[in-house]
Interface confidence: low
């Protein structure tokens, strides 16, 4: 058993048939010694008396809010949550496996630049009685500070018969060093509580590996005289790290016909302009990637050829 | 070439070669995203590899103030990785394919280090690992880890030289 926060405790249970469970001793937070009784949740049934209560926690029916009273007055509460371990593996029932980039990916994170700011998100089909808390650090044996905000519901989607809820959180490394080569990964830890079930999820990454620039901005076309060619120009996204002479991007320019089956023409360039042939009804798209480290490409920025 | 006493390197040549190093490092190990090497050992996996750290003066401001600190750190790293790529870790079994970019990568690391430090001028270098993994699979894993670490190192070096070429070239 360990304390998650004040008056909230997590009991770690091996979840197998006939498991003996965990013996837990609860102590009433009071100077009183006599006349103390214990109840569980809303029930008025007295579970025991005295300053301490010993219980055997085996299943969710044994978890909940234990309250000690004296003469009708509430003295203190202890909320017991369960963390299940089945076949040696902690349960991951609350969050959905996003399966990208690999199986057992519950948390996904992205950064728009090297400032030490990043966003993580996760999915669940649970809509009520759900709380999350997020902690993060750089490294684990001698952790350096990362500050995370509160997790918020950021999107709702219908997937077949199910509703899916996306939660996200923004974090910022306290003493970020954008130009340095990271040697210790960022660790993100999410505590999830659904009713009386506790689970924790972790992700470990380098900022450089989760970089995904915003799409290039101000994408413009300039027709070239007496030619089917156009000059495409664009700018670095505002959110990208500066100076751009140091934090450079590379770009992919694509000409795509109306039909998805039509052949795509692609040009790669380090410049912020390119000359391409504009076909009728086609569109021109540009996306960006870190020039020196192959993290994710940005989404496309597009303009129609006409 | 960098000259003892702290004159400027050939920023543009260094820029071109460091960008080539980035390309080679990724072609030598393109599967980076698909193999989470940190699962094989937590934050200290490549803990003696020379990293370009916050205090090494490789940020734009530090380069403007005095690029020598940063160039020395980059040189140290280049020599370190050049020795690693020439070691038993890469030359032993399982053999690299004849057209593997590792050979080119090795030569380019040496080339860039020589651009930074002419003969006869010696910056202190970090001691080089003398590990000879006993199992081929260990060697393979170690190669992945080294290449992954090298990708991060050369990315920072390339930024430094790109910025130097754009802002510090005579």
């Amino acid at each position: 058993i360990w304390e998650l926060k004040k008056d909230v405790y997590v009991v770690e249970l091996d979840w197998y048939p006939d498991a003996p469970g965990e013996m837990v001793v609860l102590t009433c937070d009071t100077p009183e010694e006599d006349g103390i009784t214990w109840t569980l949740d809303q029930s008025s049934e007295v579970l025991g008396s005295g300053k301490t209560l010993t219980i055997q926690v085996k299943e969710f029916g044994d978890a909940g809010q234990y309250t000690c009273h004296k003469g009708g007055e509430v003295l203190s509460h202890s909320l017991l949550l369960l963390h299940k371990k089945e076949d040696g593996i902690w349960s991951t029932d609350i969050l959905k496996d996003q399966k990208e980039p690999k199986n057992k990916t519950f948390l996904r994170c992205e950064a728009k630049n090297y400032s030490g700011r990043f966003t993580c998100w996760w999915l669940t089909t649970i809509s009520t009685d759900l709380t999350f808390s997020v902690k993060s650090s750089r490294g684990s044996s001698d952790p350096q500070g990362v500050t995370c905000g509160a997790a918020t519901l950021s999107a709702e989607r219908v997937r077949g018969d199910n509703k899916e809820y996306e939660y996200s959180v923004e974090c910022q490394e306290d003493s970020a060093c954008p130009a340095a080569e990271e040697s210790l990964p960022i660790e993100v830890m999410v505590d999830a509580v659904h009713k009386l079930k506790y689970e924790n999820y972790t992700s470990s990454f380098f900022i450089r590996d989760i970089i995904k620039p915003d799409p290039p901005k101000n994408l413009q076309l300039k027709p070239l005289k007496n030619s089917r060619q156009v000059e495409v120009s664009w700018e670095y996204p505002d959110t990208w790290s500066t100076p751009h002479s140091y934090f450079s991007l590379t770009f992919c320019v694509q000409v795509q016909g109306k039909s998805k089956r039509e052949k795509k023409d692609r040009v790669f360039t380090d410049k912020t302009s390119a000359t391409v042939i504009c076909r009728k009804n086609a569109s021109i798209s540009v996306r960006a990637q870190d020039r020196y480290y192959s993290s994710s490409w940005s989404e496309w920025a597009s303009v129609p050829c006409s | 070439r960098a000259v003892p006493g702290g004159s400027s390197p050939a920023w543009t040549q260094c820029q071109q070669l460091s960008q080539k190093l980035c390309t080679l490092a990724w072609s030598a190990h393109p599967l980076v995203g698909h193999m989470d090497l940190r699962e094989e050992g937590d934050e200290e996996t490549t803990n003696d590899v020379p990293h370009i750290q916050c205090g090494d003066g490789c940020d734009p401001q530090g380069l403007r103030d005095n690029s020598q600190f940063c160039l020395q750190r980059i040189h140290q790293g280049l020599i370190f990785y050049e020795k690693l790529l020439g070691s038993d870790i890469f030359t032993g079994e399982p053999s690299l394919l004849p057209d593997s970019p590792v050979g080119q990568l090795h030569a380019s690391l040496l080339g860039l280090s020589q651009l930074l430090q002419p003969e006869g001028h010696h910056w202190e270098t970090q001691q080089i690992p003398s590990l000879s993994p006993s199992q081929p699979w260990q060697r393979l894993l170690l190669r992945f880890k080294i290449l992954r670490s090298l990708q991060a190192f050369v990315a920072v070096a390339a930024r430094v030289f790109a910025h130097g070429a754009a802002t510090l070239s005579p």
């Epitope: 044996s141 001698d142 | 050992g41 490549t46 803990n47 003696d48 205090g55 690992p129 590990l131």
Partner: antibody
Framework: EFQLVQSGAEVKKPGASVKVSCKAS????????MNWVRQAPGQRLEWMGV????????TYNQKFKGRVTITVDTSASTAYMELSSLRSEDTAVYYC???????WGQGTLVTVSS | DIVITQTPLSLPVTPGEPASISCRSS???????????LNWFLQRPGQSPQLLIY???TRASGVPDRFSGSGSGTDLTLKISRVEAEDVGVYYC?????????FGSGTKLEIK
């Protein structure tokens, strides 16, 4: 639980060599550097050197001028410190300590006496 | 090599009273990353050293909050707010700012 268990006490003659072992358990051995520190009777602690078990890279205290060799056997999760050309002033307790110096072995007493 | 000068050599203290140990470094242990690379250890009689404080002021896990570390890059202090009987032993500071790592000469804390 992290543990570093060292080999037993040794008595050596001047000029001989001694090899002390340090077996690690409770963590991934290759993830953390291993330091060696010694303490002569009534003296301050003295850092001898460090090894990165992942690569076998070592850094030594120059005071020991080539007399100290630190090695590892990763398959056995064990680090070794060998000190050669022993003299009476090498009589000390020798400790291994994991990166960060938060975990130490129990110490190995090496006595050098003719 | 960085030389660490530790004072006092011996420190007799009455239980419940505060105690303070100083270490002076021949070179600043404050790095550009803002961290000061100094450890404090307690070595009880017949035992291995135990890490108390790392990075000048961060308590190692399980170390009581009566122990605190402070200082500048070169002048560093370990304070015990109220000495208890279990605190007896030799206290060492250690710099890990550069190789070779070096230790102070030690301060023997004893109960009056």
């Amino acid at each position: 639980e992290f543990q570093l268990v060292q080999s037993g006490a040794e008595v050596k003659k001047p000029g001989a060599s001694v090899k002390v072992s340090c077996k690690a358990s409770g963590y991934t051995f290759t993830d953390h550097n291993m330091n060696w520190v010694r303490q002569a009777p009534g003296q301050r602690l003295e850092w001898m050197g460090v090894i990165n078990p992942n690569y076998g890279t070592t850094t030594y205290n120059q005071k020991f001028k080539g007399r100290v060799t630190i090695t590892v056997d990763t398959s056995a999760s064990t680090a070794y410190m060998e000190l050669s050309s022993l003299r009476s002033e090498d009589t000390a307790v020798y400790y291994c300590a994991r990166r960060g110096f938060a975990y130490w072995g129990q110490g190995t007493l090496v006595t050098v006496s003719s | 090599d960085i030389v660490i000068t530790q004072t006092p050599l011996s420190l007799p203290v009455t239980p419940g009273e505060p105690a303070s140990i100083s270490c002076r470094s021949s070179k600043s242990l404050l790095y550009k990353d803002g961290k000061t690379y100094l450890n404090w250890f307690l070595q009880r009689p017949g035992q291995s050293p135990q890490l108390l404080i790392y990075l000048m002021s961060t308590r190692a896990s399980g170390v009581p909050d009566r122990f605190s570390g402070s200082g500048s890059g070169t002048d560093l202090t370990l304070k015990i707010s109220r000495v208890e009987a279990e605190d007896v032993g030799v206290y060492y500071c250690q710099q890990i700012a550069e190789y070779p790592f070096t230790f102070g000469s030690g301060t023997k804390l004893e109960i009056k």
